[in-house]
Interface confidence: medium
Amino acid sequence: VPQKPKVSLNPPWNRIFKGENVTLTCNGNNFFEVSSTKWFHNGSLSEETNSSLNIVNAKFEDSGEYKCQHQQVNESEPVYLEVFSDWLLLQASAEVVMEGQPLFLRCHGWRNWDVYKVIYYKDGEALKYWYENHNISITNATVEDSGTYYCTGKVWQLDYESEPLNITVIKAPREKYWLQ
């Protein structure tokens, strides 16, 4: 049975600033055919037929659900892209993370401007701070890492706060054990 394809993002963030670029790639098993990929944005078929969909100079209307399909194989699970205009944007490697998997958070400044005195918060409580911008890296996520995250920082000497982001860590599905 052919596997469902999977949409990946490069850079890996599904929350980006207006004007930024992101490439969505449709990955699957043995899909070597050229021009055989269908892309759907908010349910509408895109003109793009390559296995990569490039979003250049992102606009607000690029926000929404993306799915891909190879030949007549099932559609991929949806990936949701959000385009923002703000001073700070908290980006996550994933908003739903399997327990034991890594989680990366990034406090991203508008136009890639330097952000100083970056403080990450979880459920309203400061997690960690740095004088310069710094990503937070959680090597093995646990259910306790679930929560509402945001960051604050200085851009051009003024203090800003990102919109909150909900992160959910789900338990890995338990393997079935069969009695011999």
Epitope: Y116, K117, A126, L127, K128, W130, Y131
Partner: antibody, heavy 119, light 110 residues
Framework: EVQLVQSGAEVKKPGESLKISCKGS????????IGWVRQMPGKGLEWMGI????????TYSPSFQGQVTISADKSISTAYLQWSSLKASDTAMYYC????????????WGQGTMVTVSS | QSALTQPRSVSGSPGQSVTISCTGT?????????VSWYQQHPGKAPKLMIY???KRPSGVPDRFSGSKSGNTASLTISGLQAEDEADYYC??????????FGGGTKLTVL
Amino acid sequence: EVQLVQSGAEVKKPGESLKISCKGSGYTFTKYWIGWVRQMPGKGLEWMGIIYPGDSDTTYSPSFQGQVTISADKSISTAYLQWSSLKASDTAMYYCAKDNPFTGSFDIWGQGTMVTVSS
Amino acid sequence: QSALTQPRSVSGSPGQSVTISCTGTSNDVGGYTYVSWYQQHPGKAPKLMIYDVSKRPSGVPDRFSGSKSGNTASLTISGLQAEDEADYYCSSYAGSYTWVFGGGTKLTVL
């Protein structure tokens, strides 16, 4: 009251090991970086390194990298500075200091620990 | 990572003003606003007097002021008082979670 209380003065011989401590109270110890500063007799302040007790993330001054080890035990709100083999030139007053991200400075200092290394 | 450069000593009479300079590089003083000044009396721990170049913590008299131009920061003490006699150290963030201190300046109130 926010304070850092350091362990008492030490007199050691060259080659011996030592671990001095800095206990924080009156604030959430795991949430603020703690720095260590050396002051040799009659000399100025030298920044040695810093630790974030929440996850033991540590950064050293190049001058002190490999010479000392900075650690922390968050369960007892204590940071440590240790030597595996002391030298006479380690004779100094050592201060721990709490970093404050809102002032970009070390706002609270321990009283200092005098370490004397002599044969 | 070299120490910031401060004058060895300065002096002034009560009521006068004195300024202590602190020269670094674009990698420390010139590159960040995180410049602090500490006062240290003999046998005591340092005390924060100025942070973020020019801000005073509560309890520090407004006779103490700070400024910065390029790679040089300055501490000015106006209306000198006898209790101001102490050693003064500047400090700057130097990137990648490292700091650097100045060599210290001995202030004598004549």
